[in-house]
């Protein structure tokens, strides 16, 4: 017949007891059963006692009473009484359960997780359940996500059972968080705290934290450690495969490090203890979570005994430049184990010879190349717990850029003048290594007599390389060379003499080497003018005459030429433009500007400056001249004229020194007749003597001169006698 | 790098306006709750409001309720607070924070970004 | 005036214990989780125990956190001068439906 399922004393599918009363139970079946009770039910505990009697018509039946002492909210949950050693198959008809609620208005839920939430894994898609079940099935629990969403429940996606918690159907991304389950019991608050974690398949990244290649001696221990990193909510396999995996030479310890709030870290050491040459291969370690796969690998080389090989990298004699940021000085080094390394310069230790020089590997860097690094360089390598020693030299030239000394001295802010006809010696000393040569170069100034540009040197104009017999530009006399030892350097000395400076234009001395060229230019600018610039006042005009002053100036130095007069008004000193560059007149060397004030008035005297601009400098010049206009005054005689006897045939000076403003002019008269300059008559400068050569007879007479200007005239009268024979009457 | 930064702090006039904007990086924005708390010279912290991963609830302080308001654009991974109404107790160093990893705490903050409220 | 109060200040020598306290109320410490943040002057503040007790990665085991009823404290072991700094407490409100802080402890380092 077919088997009767046993019946519990209380009917139905569920029953609420209150929290400290006593369960009763019974189990009425036709077979041996046994109880299954909540995982917090202990049925080691004293609280909980099962009893077995037979029962029933003629005790047939077998009977369990399950009696709970003083029963608490965690023993919540499934109770049920099934047969013995009945197929599974026929689990309905063998089993009869009931869910049991133990109702604690203290504890509304059967697991409160309020100190430390409890993590739930959950995958997208899939049935998601937050089990905060009650203790009493008609609590109202109300889930929310922190800090401010609510999970309704809608009896589809999210369904709210008692006596499993909140089941969310089809979980998504919306549901990974904080969880909170809330329920208010008599007003008091209760919460209990879950939080999901999506479980995902990301590996972000694997690797093996030793060097690669790994090297390693004979008999020694291999560690290889694999990190395979991923999101918190990520679980990894992780496995090696490795040269002797058959014979399971390797030991795998495992961790992982839960520590970061941001990722997980999965840890797989593999150690194979005292290596032999069969240990030697590719080692390589896969991370599996689901379908996501990641591997990473490393060789692993296994050497018999230490060793050191070392060659140059290119040749044996290298060469780098001074002023390079940083030189790296490397050999070609195989070796293990891992040598110490020393470098050595001329025999000393490198690097405490200067802080510019650090060891890298088997490289020496030298920081800021000076031509002091130049030398011999010895890299020293030992494994000394292997008595293994080798050592290599290498020659290294440091070239340096040609410098011209003069360049670096010069302070004139703007070029020399050379006088015009001038013989010149030009030099230019030059250092670089290699020794550079010099070679001289001309370059003619641009000649502009247009009115808009003043004269000017440019890098325009062609230039021509100079030898001892170029005829190009000036004459030069001679290019010569000579080495010399300055400041302990052997420095090269070109110098170029000019025999005539004529041509105004630029010598450039040209330093060259490999490395590089270098240039001095010297402006050659020719001058007529003393210092290159001169005011010349032609004399200091007296009331109506004219006022003549000329300022001359170098025309490769100077430009934008002009006279001014300065005047004082309220102890201020006014400029006043007078003339200007227009009106210059250009020559081969220099400007000349003139200045002309006709029929001049006292009120034009004053303070006159000729004013130019430095080319190079762009300072203003000026150089003054003080002109003070004379007043008209008539003209007086220094000293009267005086009688006075002469001999025949010798010779005699009349003199008429006047003064007066302007400047009288003087008129010579003999016996009321006007003297005119005729053979034997000389009449001296500014005719204020009158000379007579071989006297005669007929030269005696009243000498009568007169001084005159605009203001008036004045006079002086003379008798010259004429004592002795003429050569003709002796003749007679 | 997980970061945030905020900007848009100035000098405004009482009554004025002003958007603070806070740009997240190094992290999934869109999953978290984000916060903006403030601290004005020498004074202790003071929370702002408080926006839904999905920016579709909000909470805000009763000092500030009625005159600012919190949002987010997940697509620009930015969170803003608009702050109308200004007064002078408003100015302050306002930092913006936020929820990620598993401490739901604040365990993300920005550099902040400083609001002056003065005539 | 804050929600959860702190002392003001509390002070310790190298090597010392120092406890901080915060203290709230049901609808605050009692039913949420209680964080401590650090702020070093001049920058932003910095979580220092989340969830009641627990630390995050970076964070010396010398801080503790603990929790019992409407208080909650954060205690600093074996202080180290860059220790110096204000904390703050901080919890959801339920009533307020927010973050409350409490108003700060300047933490100072003697000696």
């Known amino acids: 017949s077919k088997l009767k399922g046993p019946e519990l004393s209380l009917k139905g599918t569920q029953h609420v007891t209150q929290a400290g009363q006593t369960l009763h139970l019974q189990c009425r079946g036709e077979a041996a059963h046994q109880w299954s009770l909540p995982e917090t039910v202990s049925k080691e505990s004293k609280r909980l006692s099962i009893t077995k009697s037979a029962c029933g018509r003629n005790g047939k039946q077998f009977c369990s009473t399950l009696t709970l002492n003083a029963a608490q909210a965690n023993h919540t949950g499934f109770y049920s009484c099934k047969y013995l050693a009945v197929p599974t198959s026929k689990k309905k008809e063998t089993e009869s359960a009931i869910y049991i609620f133990i109702s604690d208005t203290g504890r509304p839920f059967v697991e409160m997780y309020s100190e430390i939430p409890e993590i739930i894994h959950m995958t997208e898609g899939r049935e998601l359940i937050i089990p905060c079940r009650v203790t009493s099935p008609n609590i109202t629990v109300t889930l929310k996500k922190f800090p401010l969403d609510t999970l309704i429940p809608d009896g589809k996606r999210v369904i709210w059972d008692s006596r499993k918690g909140f089941i969310i159907s089809n979980a998504t991304y919306k549901e990974i968080g904080l969880l909170t389950c809330e329920a208010t019991v008599n007003g008091h608050l209760y919460k209990t705290n879950y939080l999901t974690h999506r479980q995902t398949n990301t590996i972000i990244d694997v690797q093996i934290s030793t060097p690669r290649p790994v090297k390693l001696l004979r008999g020694h221990t291999l560690i290889l450690n694999c990190t395979a990193t991923t999101p918190l909510n990520t679980r990894v396999q992780m496995t090696w495969s490795y040269p002797d995996e058959k014979n399971k030479r390797a030991s795998v310890r495992r961790r992982i490090d839960q520590s970061n709030s941001h990722a997980n870290i999965f840890y797989s050491v593999l150690t194979i203890d005292k290596v032999q040459n069969k240990d030697k291969g590719l080692y390589t370690c896969r991370v599996r979570s689901g379908p996501s796969f990641k591997s990473v690998n490393t060789s692993v080389h296994i050497y018999d005994k230490a060793f050191i090989t070392v060659k140059h990298r290119k040749q044996q004699v290298l060469e780098t430049v001074a002023g390079k940021r940083s030189y790296r000085l490397s050999m070609k080094v195989k070796a293990f184990p891992s040598p110490e390394v020393v470098w050595l310069k001329d025999g000393l230790p490198a690097t405490e010879k200067s802080a510019r020089y650090l060891t890298r590997g088997y490289s020496l860097i030298i920081k800021d190349v000076t031509e002091e690094d130049a030398g011999n360089y010895t890299i020293l390598l030992s494994i000394k717990q292997s008595n293994v020693f080798k050592n290599l030299t290498a020659t290294l030239i440091v070239n340096v850029k040609p410098q011209i000394y003069e360049k670096a001295v010069s302070s004139f802010p703007d070029p020399a003048l050379y006088p015009l006809g001038s013989r010149q010696i030009l030099t230019c000393t030059a250092y670089g290594i290699p020794r550079p040569t010099i070679k001289w170069c001309w370059r003619p100034c641009n000649h502009n007599h247009s009115e808009a540009r003043y004269d000017f040197c440019s890098n325009n104009e062609e230039s021509f390389i100079l030898d001892p017999d170029s005829n190009i530009g000036n004459r030069i006399e001679s290019i010569t060379q000579r080495m010399a030892i300055i400041e302990g350097k052997n420095k090269t000395a070109s110098t170029l003499v000019v025999a005539d400076s004529r041509i105004s234009g630029i010598y450039s001395c040209i330093a060259s080497n490999k490395v590089g060229t270098v240039g001095r230019n010297i402006s050659f600018y020719i001058t007529d003018v003393p210092n290159g610039f001169h005011v010349n006042l032609e004399k200091m005009p007296t009331e109506g005459e004219d006022l003549k002053l000329s300022c001359t100036v170098n025309k490769f130095l100077y430009r934008d030429v002009t006279w001014i007069l300065l005047r004082t008004v309220n102890n201020r000193t006014m400029h006043y433009s007078i003339s200007k560059q227009k009106m210059a007149i250009t020559k081969e060397h220099s400007i000349t500007l003139n200045l002309t004030i006709m029929n001049v008035s006292l009120e034009d005297s004053g303070t006159y400056a000729c004013r130019a601009r430095n080319v190079y400098t762009g300072e203003e010049i000026l150089q003054k001249k003080e002109v003070t206009i004379r007043d008209q005054e008539a003209p007086y005689l220094l000293r009267n004229l005086s009688d006075h006897t002469v001999a025949i045939s010798s010779s005699t000076t009349l003199d008429c020194h006047a003064n007066g403003a302007p400047e009288p002019q003087i008129t010579w008269f003999k016996n009321n007749h006007k003297i005119q300059q005729e053979p034997g008559i000389i009449l001296g400068p500014g005719s204020s003597t009158l000379f007579i050569e071989r006297v005669t007879e007929e030269d005696e007479g009243v000498y009568h001169c007169k001084a005159t200007n605009q203001k008036g005239s004045v006079e002086s009268s003379a008798y010259l006698t004429v004592q002795g024979t003429s050569d003709k009457s002796n003749l007679e | 790098e997980v970061q945030l930064l905020e900007s848009g702090g100035g000098l405004v006039q009482p009554g004025g306006s002003l958007r603070l904007s806070c740009e997240a990086s190094g992290f999934d924005f869109s999953t978290y709750a984000m916060n903006w708390v403030r601290q004005a010279p020498g004074k202790g912290l003071e929370w702002v409001a408080t926006i839904n991963s999905e920016g579709t609830i909000t909470s805000h302080a009763p000092a500030v309720k009625g005159r600012f308001t919190i949002s987010r654009d997940n697509s620009k991974n930015t969170a803003y607070v608009q702050m109308n109404s200004l007064r002078a107790e408003d100015s302050a160093v306002y930092y913006c924070s936020s929820t990620t990893g598993t401490t739901h705490g604040m365990d993300v903050w920005g550099r902040g970004t400083t609001v002056t409220v003065s005539s | 005036q804050s929600v959860l109060t702190q002392p003001p200040s509390a002070s310790g020598t190298p090597g010392q214990r120092v406890t901080i306290s915060c203290s709230g109320s049901s609808s605050n410490i009692q039913n949420n989780y209680v964080y401590w943040y650090q702020q070093l002057p001049g920058t932003a503040p910095k979580l220092l125990i989340y969830?009641?007790?627990q630390r995050p990665s970076g964070v010396p085991d010398r801080f503790s956190g603990s929790k019992s009823g409407t208080s909650a404290s954060l205690a600093i072991s074996g202080l180290q001068s860059e220790d110096e700094a204000d904390y703050y407490c901080g919890t959801w409100d339920d009533s307020l439906n927010g973050w409350v802080f409490g108003g700060g402890t300047k933490l100072t380092v003697l000696g």
């Open positions: 969830f009641n007790s």
